[in-house]
């Protein structure tokens, strides 16, 4: 006899990276018929929702109106059907951004490179941080960690057209508190003509929608959205 129900999916909308003082919604998708959902933060019960009517709802939302460093951390959720509880969801790392300062990002040898060349991004932030994150905008949620007293190096390559796109970096004050994003650097890779059609550029965001950072969801499928979030977060860990 089954002792637990399948684990729910957890994700954040619009994204798990939330600028301070902005709103975010944590979504938990379980099964129809679930009578109770619990959201846990850093291992402790944080919020409870009891959907009505349970047989017509398989997803609940926990709204955070004003993101701050105290709300940043690891979230998970569980749900209950009758007396039977589910397995806990995967962990959702909710990150607060736009803390303190803005790093600078430069790329060597430059923003326009030739396929096959090796590329290094440099991220610098003078305030007290030793961890840096380089993120490539677009659906595939590329995240790299780097370490250094005031700056970190992020080697890429040899590059192909798949590396084309817009990059930003953050300084990380802890795992869940990041700086403002750097100004974007758009990497253009030329000279790999025969492979161009095999490696289309990731969709990028207009400058004013960087709030959504890495994610685009065209399908509207919540499970896909959750999986993209987990991809990025697993890379972060």
């Amino acid at each position: 006899q089954q002792q637990t129900l399948p684990k729910p999916f957890i994700w954040a909308e619009p994204h798990f990276m939330v600028p301070k003082e902005k709103q975010v919604t944590i979504c938990c998708q379980g099964n129809y018929g679930a009578v109770e959902y619990q959201l846990h933060f850093e291992g402790s019960l944080f919020a409870v929702d009891r959907p009505k009517p349970p047989e017509r709802i398989n997803k609940v939302q926990f709204y955070i109106p004003d993101m701050n460093s105290r709300m940043a951390g690891q979230y998970s959720c569980i749900y209950r059907v009758g007396e039977l509880w589910s397995e806990p969801s995967n962990l959702l790392d909710l990150v607060v951004t736009e803390m303190y300062d803005t790093p600078t990002l430069s790329v060597h040898p430059g923003p326009e490179v030739i396929s096959g060349e090796k590329v290094t991004f440099y991220c610098r932030l003078d305030t007290a941080t030793s961890m840096f994150l380089l993120l490539k905008e677009g659906r595939s949620s590329h995240v790299q960690r780097g370490y250094g007293k005031v700056q970190a190096e992020f080697p890429l390559g040899p590059v192909t057209t798949a590396h084309r796109g817009t990059y930003r970096c953050f300084g990380s004050y802890n795992n869940h508190a990041w700086s403002f994003p750097s100004e974007p650097v758009k990497l253009l890779v030329t000279g790999d003509i025969e492979n161009t059609s095999l490696a289309p550029e990731d969709p990028t965001f207009p400058a004013d929608t960087w709030g959504t950072y890495l994610l685009t969801t065209e399908t509207g499928l919540q499970k896909d959205h959750a999986l993209w979030d987990h991809t990025a977060q697993n890379l972060l860990r």
């Epitope: 060597h108 090796k118 440099y122 390559g157």
Partner: antibody
């Protein structure tokens, strides 16, 4: 066209410091890396470090940390390398080079360390 | 650090001759390699970047190629002004490093 102007030569005493300049023109100074390299008489080239004028990001060859400090003055489109505690080992030609791929080179400054 | 082993260190050749200089990289550098020319007065000019791309204004007799970790500069037909020093330079991984140089002399 791109020009990187460096003083021809400089004579300095042992133990002193010297600041070498590289005045750039013919391109947008803040958009390209500036490298510095050293060449002792009759020897090959050694990379000292580079700096990006726009971001201030700099990176050094471990061998030259504590010896060389790179700075820029964007208002005059000039890059500098500061060499400290000079000895005869620092007597060499010092070159600046523009761009991540070392696209263009200055004519070099000959530094002679002698008492 | 990546070592760039350049050979030969000196080479005697005749006008009109075809010559090749080689640099071997101790680690993968992709196509991040330049060839530089240095005149007796110290003037340095880049000839080739990204392994095989010819700089504008550089004569077509110069060409660059790669085979595995070996990078070559070929001069198809030597002219009198070519008898100077040549260096390779990798810009793949910091610290960027130069080969030891090749002195090309007229026979």
């Amino acid at each position: 066209q791109v020009q990187l102007q460096q003083p021809g030569s400089v004579l300095v005493r042992p133990g002193a410091s010297v600041k070498l300049s590289c005045k750039a023109s013919g391109y947008t100074f803040t958009s390209s890396w500036m490298h510095w390299a050293k060449q002792r008489p009759g020897q090959g080239l050694e990379w000292i470090g580079h700096i990006h004028p726009n971001s201030g990001i700099s990176n050094y060859n471990e061998k030259f940390k504590g010896k060389a400090t790179l700075t820029v003055d964007t208002s005059s489109s000039t890059a500098y390398v500061d060499l400290s505690s000079l000895t005869s080992e620092d007597s060499a030609v010092y070159y600046c080079a523009r761009g991540g791929r070392f696209d263009d080179w200055g004519a070099g400054t000959t530094v002679t360390v002698s008492s | 650090d990546i070592q760039m082993t350049q050979s030969p260190s000196s080479l005697s050749a005749s006008l009109g001759e075809r010559v090749s200089l080689t640099c071997r990289a101790s680690q993968d550098i992709g196509s991040s390699l330049n060839w530089l020319q240095q005149e007796p007065d110290g003037t340095i000019k880049r000839l080739i970047y990204a392994t095989s791309s010819l700089d504008s204004g550089v004569p077509k007799r110069f060409s660059g190629s790669r085979s595995g970790s070996d990078y070559s500069l070929t001069i198809s037909s030597l002219e009198s002004e070519d008898f100077v020093d040549y260096y390779c330079l990798q810009y793949a991984s910091s610290p960027w490093t130069f080969g030891g140089g090749t002195k090309l002399e007229i026979k």
